[in-house]
């Protein structure tokens, strides 16, 4: 016996399709050898129409495909379009040749069965509603009217104009006429499930003289939309459920063995294997709305369904729209680390990808919030101003061209804690999740800033020192002035950088920024920061603040970023003069600077600026300096 | 509550015929698939046919290997019922045969896993 299994005779009518699943034994091979579907002639030759490797015959051209789904075992055949020519054998099989392991299947097709020819069609969906146009003679206005539901032996009432109502229809059927008009009345029917599909007869009247017509009623399950998406990249769930469900709660579920379960609804459920990268946006008032999931990973693949009832939970009789998505595991999207760590105090750069083919796509981040019906309120973006709360520790560093951008978040708190996108207005895609997780800091900083108290006098001087440990000795150090559009990179002269050393003190490797002469400009938030090439590492920042030279003035320290820095040893530095004053930018709002939120974010408009980079947006001119210190014991 | 009633069993000559019915009730019934499966004494129970259908006109049909021609599955005009016309009988028929049905989407129709509802079984007994 053929160890292939599959439905020995499959039987179906012209126009309609058929999904012919064959089923293969678990081994490796198995799953990736050809598979195949082939008729049998009688010569005994089985021609192939269909193969796993995109062999097509002409006859399937366009109505026909093989998908393997290996996790199962098993392999689909759909064919549509079916006409009495597909009438045969067949067989499915696996191997190189169609003489390898198969299973024979018999198909036939069939004319589509007759009905009284003055049978009315009606063609509805699940959950919605149907009305039924029945015609009568004007004597039959006075008499009783009907409708009934054919079964094998007798004809079932649903309703007629008594008010009689069949249990199953109780609240779902409507008997009525409209107006004045005496000759046709109409019954409704909602909520409509497969079980109301079928032949039914209206009718006015009673004996010989009665007004009867047929009606064929088909309720259709809706065919899944098939949704191919990269692991890693995200998927928008366009649901459209019509006007009718516009004020229902409404929800996203995935189909299991027995039900649907619930991932995302508008009253607040939210399944936890979502968490942070699920969104769902009522879209307008007419019952549509979208789902949005990022991060996709492999057991998102699934059959899945949406839906409005006013539980926000699957009902029988409620419209519905379904999806089959298939998650392709040979990704385009760089797989990077979904969950990043800092500690309170320090810093983290997070790497964004994005497609490299759209380096002047505007780039995002956000973050997801579940509150509701989740949002992702935009924090920083090329041309989006970091929001204030994140003033003087929030930067984004566009690297045109290499597919990455990279997101620097400083002076962490364990309220940073959460679910963050990266996401760009170009390839919808490519939106990506982290989770940023932050720890009570154990030991002291790796980079640490001095003098604690910077507060620069104008017209002087000033100049701060960034140490950083012999772990950081090989990578380039930079100091950098935030703006709310970027910090910029200062130019930096990094002397004894490259002589090699016998040993590195801990005590003295430092990287320093002065200041001369200071102006009024030059108060705010600087970084400094540890980079090697394109991929940066921690920062540090400081706030300086510049007044006007008092007698005996007293500095007050403006945040608490500056009581966190420690106070370091004595160091020679070396100094470099800045003499350029800072270009005043003006500031640019962003494509969310009204609603800055990424909701619709399926929808976003296509910019039309050209991007600008957020790590050169400044203008400034400042330099800054480093000194190695090499003792040798 | 879904219920699954079989019927139809019974004595029979080897080479004689029966036929087994399965009434479905309940009305959360709405499965569009019904499997038979049969259990000897001392014996695994063991996959005898399936049949789903796809809208009105379109069927798929299921055999166990053993079935070889004689055994046909079909659904009654009445959605809730499904027969198993057994031909050529032979005492290794005889056992205790089972209707069962899934709630919804099913993997593979051989394995038991794949239903969740199931009748209580009726007797067939094949004398030589």
């Known amino acids: 016996k053929s160890p292939i299994f599959g439905p020995q005779e499959v039987s179906s009518i012209e126009g309609d399709s058929v999904s012919i699943t064959c089923y293969y034994p678990d081994t490796s091979v198995n799953r990736h050898t050809r598979k195949y579907w082939c008729r049998q002639g009688a010569s005994g030759m089985c021609t192939t129409l269909i193969s796993s490797n995109g062999y097509l015959s002409k006859e399937y051209s366009g109505r026909a495909n093989l998908i393997n789904f290996p996790e199962n075992n098993t392999f689909v055949i759909n064919i549509e379009q079916l006409t009495q020519d597909d009438t045969g054998s067949y067989k499915c099989g696996l191997g190189t040749s169609n003489r390898g392991l198969s299973f024979d299947v018999s198909l036939e097709v069939s004319q589509v069965p007759e009905l009284p020819s003055d049978t009315h069609v009606y063609t509805k969906d699940i959950g919605r509603n149907v009305t039924i146009e029945c015609p009568f003679k004007r004597e039959n206005a006075p008499s009783k009217k009907s409708l009934c539901k054919k079964t094998n032996q007798s004809c079932e009432l649903v309703i007629d104009s008594t008010e009689k109502v069949n249990p199953s229809y109780i609240g779902r059927a409507k008997l009525f006429m409209k107006g004045t008009d005496l000759t046709v009345f109409y019954v409704n029917i909602s909520h409509l499930t497969h079980n109301d599909a079928g032949l039914y007869i209206c009718q006015a009247g009673e004996g010989p003289s009665a007004d009867k017509k047929n009606v064929d009623l088909q309720v259709l399950a809706p065919e899944p939309e098939l949704l191919y998406k990269d692991l890693r990249s995200s998927v928008t769930f366009e649901c459209d459920l019509g006007r009718e469900v516009a004020n229902e709660a409404k929800y996203l579920c995935r189909m299991n063995k027995e039900t649907c379960d619930v991932i995302i609804n508008t009253l607040g459920k939210r399944d936890p294997d979502f968490e942070g990268r699920i969104l769902i946006t009522p879209k307008d008032d007419n019952g549509r709305f979208s789902v949005l999931i990022t991060g996709l990973r492999k057991e998102d693949a699934g059959h899945y369904q949406c839906g409005a009832h006013s539980s926000g939970l699957p009902q029988e009789g409620w419209p519905i729209q379904t999806w089959q998505l298939f998650v392709n595991e040979e990704s385009t999207i760089p797989n990077r680390r979904s969950v990043v760590k800092g500690v309170t105090g320090g810093s983290v750069a997070i790497a964004c990808p994005y497609n490299p083919k759209e380096s002047s796509s505007l780039k995002y981040w956000c973050r997801w919030e579940g509150d509701g019906n989740g949002h992702c309120p935009v924090l920083v973006g090329t041309q989006a101003q970091v929001q204030e709360e994140y003033e003087g520790r929030l930067a984004l560093f566009d690297q045109p061209g290499n597919g990455t951008y990279t997101v620097i978040l400083n002076q962490l708190t364990t309220e940073d804690a959460g679910f963050y996108w990266c996401l760009t207005n170009g390839d919808s895609r490519w939106r990506t999740t982290i989770e940023l997780q932050v720890a009570e800091a154990t030991r002291e900083p790796n980079l640490e800033v001095t003098p604690q108290n910077a507060t620069a006098v104008l017209g002087e001087t000033f100049t701060v020192s960034c140490h950083y440990p012999c772990k950081f000795y090989s990578q380039e150090k930079y100091w950098c002035k935030w703006s709310n559009k970027g910090c910029h990179i200062l130019p930096s002269h990094d002397e004894g950088a490259r002589q090699s050393s016998v040993s590195c003190d801990q005590s003295s490797q430092l990287v320093s920024m002065t200041l001369n002469p200071v102006s009024k400009e030059d108060e705010g938030w600087y970084w400094c920061g540890v980079k090697q090439g394109q991929t940066y590492g921690e920062t540090t920042a400081i706030y300086i603040a510049v007044e006007e030279r008092t007698r005996g003035s007293s500095h007050v320290n403006p945040t608490d970023a500056n009581a966190r820095a420690k106070v370091a040893l004595e160091e020679e530095v070396v100094d470099s003069s800045i003499s350029e004053k800072e270009n005043k930018a003006i500031p640019n709002p962003g494509p969310f600077a009204n609603e800055r939120e990424i909701q619709n974010v399926g929808d976003q408009a296509q910019e039309n600026r050209a991007s600008g980079d957020a790590g050169s947006a400044d203008g400034q001119s400042r330099s800054s300096s480093s000194k190695h210190h090499h003792h040798h014991h | 509550e879904v219920q699954l009633v079989e019927s139809g069993g019974g004595l029979v000559q080897a080479g004689g015929s029966l036929r087994l019915s399965c009434a479905a009730s309940?009305?959360?019934?709405?499965?569009?698939?019904v499997g038979w499966f049969r259990q000897a004494p001392g014996k695994e129970r063991e996959f005898v046919a399936h049949?789903?259908?796809?809208?009105?006109?379109?069927?798929?049909?299921y055999y166990g290997d053993f079935v070889k021609g004689r055994f046909t599955i079909s659904r009654g005009t009445a959605k809730n019922t499904v027969y198993l016309q057994m031909n050529s009988l032979k005492p290794e028929d005889t056992a205790v045969y089972y209707c069962?049905?899934?709630?919804?989407?099913?993997?593979?129709?051989?394995?038991?896993?794949?239903?969740?509802?199931w009748g209580q079984g009726t007797l067939v007994t094949v004398s030589s």
């Open positions: 069962a049905a899934p709630k919804g989407a099913i993997g593979d129709p051989r394995s038991t896993r794949e239903y969740d509802y």
């Open positions: 309940g009305r959360t019934f709405s499965s569009d698939a």
């Open positions: 049949i789903h259908w796809s809208g009105d006109f379109t069927t798929y049909y």
